[in-house]
C-alpha cells in the first residue's frame, strides 16, 4: 500500500482536540525503561541491581523518587552514550522536569502549553503531509536498520502507560539516518476508536487507522534529557497502519498480549521479535521533516521520518488495538493522537519524487519546493 496522493479530505474523525496528544514519542524512557547494559561478568551483579557489563559501566544511580509525578519522559529511555556503538551505558541520570509533566491528557485541560511551554512552539508535530509539495531529495538514502532482529530471550517490556502501549527496546538497535546514527529506545502506537482513525500524521488530510513510532536517540548525545530540544537529538521513525485482508503475524505477537496490560500502568514481558517486521518493507521511500515530540514536553528538533508505504493489519487486529486498553480515570485508551500542527514554513522532504506522481486532482505534476540538502 502506498500513501494516497491528493485524496479528497476525509473527516479526521479522531476526537483529538487541537492539543490532542497521543502518547508521544514523548514517552521517553524512564530509567527503568532504559535499557541498561548487558550483563557480563565484572559488575558484581548484586541482588536487585542490573548487571551491566562493560568496562565503562558506572554504578547505576537511581533517581531519588520514581513516583508517578515526574517527567514522563517516561518512555524515552535515557541511555548513556556508549563509547562503543552497541554499548549503551547505564542511564542513571534522567533529569526530572517538574511534576506536572505527567498530568497531561488528550483533549481537555490542562492545555498542553501550560504543561510544557514547548507545546506552543512553531515547529511542532504531527503535521499533514502533502506529497505534491514535498521537496524531492536524492540525498535521502534508504534507511538502514541494524540489530532490529531480536531473539525471543531476553524478553522485552510491554507497558500500558496510560496514553499508549509501549515496547522498551534493548541497547544495540541502530538506525543510520543520513550521516548520523541513532539508537532505538522504544516504540509505541497511536490509534483511534471503532470506525474512527487515529494516526497522528495525515496525508492530504487523510487520517489512517493507526500509526507506529519508533523513537531513537542520536549517538551524539549520552542521554535523552541532553538531546531534548536539540536539533537531531531525537529521531522518530513513523509508519501508518491500515486495514488489510490478513492477520499481521509480527503485530500479533504484541496485540495478543494487550489483555494482560489492559489496566493503566500495567506491564508484561513479551518474547523478543523482529522489530523491523513491524515496519514497512520499503526503506527507500519516505518523507522527512524536523518537528517535535507529539506529547508533552513537545520538545522540538526531532527528525521525523515517515514511511511512504503503509503496514497492513487485519480489521480484528485494529479493533484489538483500539478496544482493549484503559487509560486514566476508567476511560478507554482511545483516540490518543494529537491534532496536526501548522508547518509554519517548514518544507517536508521526500526521498523519492512524491510530487511527480500523477493523481486524480493534478493535471500537471507540481514540484514547488526544492530539496534543501541538494544542490552541490
Amino acid at each position: 500500500q502506498r500513501l494516497p496522493r491528493m485524496q479528497e479530505d476525509s473527516p479526521l474523525g479522531g476526537g483529538s482536540s487541537g492539543e490532542d496528544d497521543p502518547l508521544g514519542e514523548e514517552d521517553l524512557p524512564s530509567e527503568e525503561d532504559s535499557p541498561r547494559e548487558e550483563d557480563p561478568p565484572g559488575e558484581e551483579d548484586l541482588p536487585g541491581e542490573e548487571d551491566l557489563p562493560g568496562e565503562e559501566d558506572l554504578p547505576e544511580v537511581k533517581p531519588k523518587s520514581e513516583e508517578e509525578g515526574s517527567l514522563k519522559l517516561e518512555d524515552l529511555p535515557t541511555v548513556e552514550a556508549p563509547g562503543d556503538p552497541q554499548e549503551p551505558q547505564n542511564n542513571a541520570h534522567r533529569d526530572k522536569e517538574g511534576d506536572d509533566q505527567s498530568h497531561w491528557r488528550y483533549g481537555g485541560d490542562p492545555p498542553w502549553p501550560r504543561v510544557s511551554p514547548a507545546c506552543a512552539g512553531r515547529f511542532q508535530s504531527p503535521v499533514d503531509i502533502r506529497p505534491q509539495l514535498a521537496a524531492f531529495c536524492p540525498a535521502l538514502r534508504p534507511l538502514e536498520l541494524l540489530g532490529f532482529q531480536l531473539p525471543p530471550l531476553p524478553e522485552l517490556r510491554l507497558r500500558n502507560n496510560g496514553h499508549s502501549v509501549q515496547l522498551t527496546l534493548p541497547p544495540g538497535l541502530e538506525m543510520a539516518l543520513g550521516p548520523g546514527r541513532e539508537y532505538a529506545l522504544q516504540l509505541h502506537l497511536h490509534w483511534g476508536a471503532a470506525g474512527r482513525p487515529g494516526s497522528e500524521h495525515t496525508v492530504e488530510g487523510h487520517r489512517f487507522p493507526a500509526e507506529i513510532h519508533v523513537v531513537h536517540l542520536s549517538t551524539a548525545f549520552a542521554r535523552v534529557d541532553e538531546a531534548l530540544g536539540r536539533p537531531g537529538g531525537l529521531a522518530v521513525l513513523a509508519a501508518f497502519l491500515e486495514e488489510g485482508p490478513e492477520e499481521n503475524s509480527a503485530y500479533e505477537q504484541l496485540l495478543s498480549r494487550l489483555e494482560e496490560i489492559a489496566e493503566e500502568g500495567s506491564e508484561t514481558q513479551v518474547p523478543g521479535l523482529d522489530i523491523s517486521a513491524l515496519l514497512p518493507s520499503d526503506f527507500s521511500r519516505y518523507f522527512q521533516y524536523e518537528g517535535s515530540l507529539t506529547t508533552p514536553p513537545c520538545a522540538q528538533g526531532v527528525i521525523w521520518t515517515v514511511f511512504n508505504q503503509t503496514v497492513m493489519l487485519s480489521a480484528k487486529q485494529l479493533h484489538t488495538l483500539s478496544d482493549t486498553l484503559w487509560g486514566p480515570g476508567d476511560s478507554r485508551l482511545q483516540l490518543n493522537f494529537r491534532a496536526t500542527q501548522p508547518l509554519n514554513g517548514r518544507v517536508i522532504e521526500a526521498s523519492f519524487p512524491a510530487g511527480v506522481d500523477s493523481s486524480p486532482r493534478a493535471a500537471e505534476p507540481v514540484q514547488l519546493n526544492s530539496c534543501l540538502a541538494a544542490g552541490d
Epitope: 535499557p35 541498561r36 547494559e37 548487558e38 550483563d39 557480563p40 561478568p41 558484581e44 551483579d45 548484586l46 541482588p47 536487585g48 541491581e49 542490573e50 548487571d51 557489563p53 562503543d84 556503538p85 552497541q86 554499548e87 541494524l146 540489530g147 532490529f148 532482529q149 531480536l150 531473539p151 525471543p152 530471550l153 531476553p154 524478553e155 534493548p170 541497547p171 544495540g172 514481558q269 518474547p271 523478543g272 523482529d274 523491523s276
Partner: antibody, heavy 119, light 111 residues
Framework: QVQLQESGGGLVQPGGSLRLSCAAS????????MSWVRQAPGKGLEWVSA????????YYADSVKGRFTISRDNSKNTLYLQMNSLRAEDTAVYYC????????????WGQGTLVTVSS | QSVLTQPPSVSGAPGQRVTISCTGS?????????VHWYQQLPGTAPKLLIY???NRPSGVPARFSGSKSATSASLAITGLQADDEADYYC??????????FGGGTKLTLLR
Amino acid sequence: QVQLQESGGGLVQPGGSLRLSCAASGFTFSSYAMSWVRQAPGKGLEWVSAISGSGGSTYYADSVKGRFTISRDNSKNTLYLQMNSLRAEDTAVYYCAKIGRYSSSLGYWGQGTLVTVSS
Amino acid sequence: QSVLTQPPSVSGAPGQRVTISCTGSSSNIGRGYNVHWYQQLPGTAPKLLIYDNTNRPSGVPARFSGSKSATSASLAITGLQADDEADYYCQSYDSGLRWVFGGGTKLTLLR
C-alpha cells in the same frame, strides 16, 4: 557476585531419567532468562534449552524436545532440567547459564555437572 | 555439523595477532542476529568474551575485539599471550534452530 552451581549429574542407564538443578545467587534471579548448554566429551558446545524469567516461555533444541523439560522456582532461585528417556548421546557436561537482561549472550556460567548415560 | 562454521584450529606466536572467523547464513547472522564469543580454557566452563558483536564485558582485555559483516563474524586477538591458549566459540540465534554455537576453534601458541 553472580554464582551458578549445578548439581544432580551422575551415571544413568539408557531410557532412564535424571533431574539437574542449578542454584543461583548474586542477582535477582526472577529478572533473568536462563539456559542449559551441554558439552559432550571432547566436543563443542550445544544449546539445550532456555526459559524466560517468569518461567512462562520455554525453548528446546530439536534433539531434546519431548524428552527434556526446563523449569524454574523463583522462590528458591533454582533452575531445573528434567531429563527423561536418556540416550547415550546425551552424555555430556551440562552447564546452566544466565542470559543477559538486554542481550542474548550467556554472561555467566556454572562449572557444570557431568551426566553419563551408559548401560 | 554446526550451523555456524569456525576453523577447527588457529595458531600464532606470542605477541602476534590472530583472527577466528564464524560463518553463518541468512537464517542467523545474515538475518541480523547478534553474535557472541566465548573462551573456554582447558578444564573450565566457558566465559563470555564478546557480546552483541563488538562489546567486551568488564574484565576482558582490549586485546580481544569482535566484528560482524553480512553473514559472518570475526574475533581478533592481538598481542597473543600464553594464557590465551583455549577453545573459542561463537554463538548466535537461528530463526529455525534457536540458539546456535559454532563448532569451536582451538587456539595454539607457537613457542
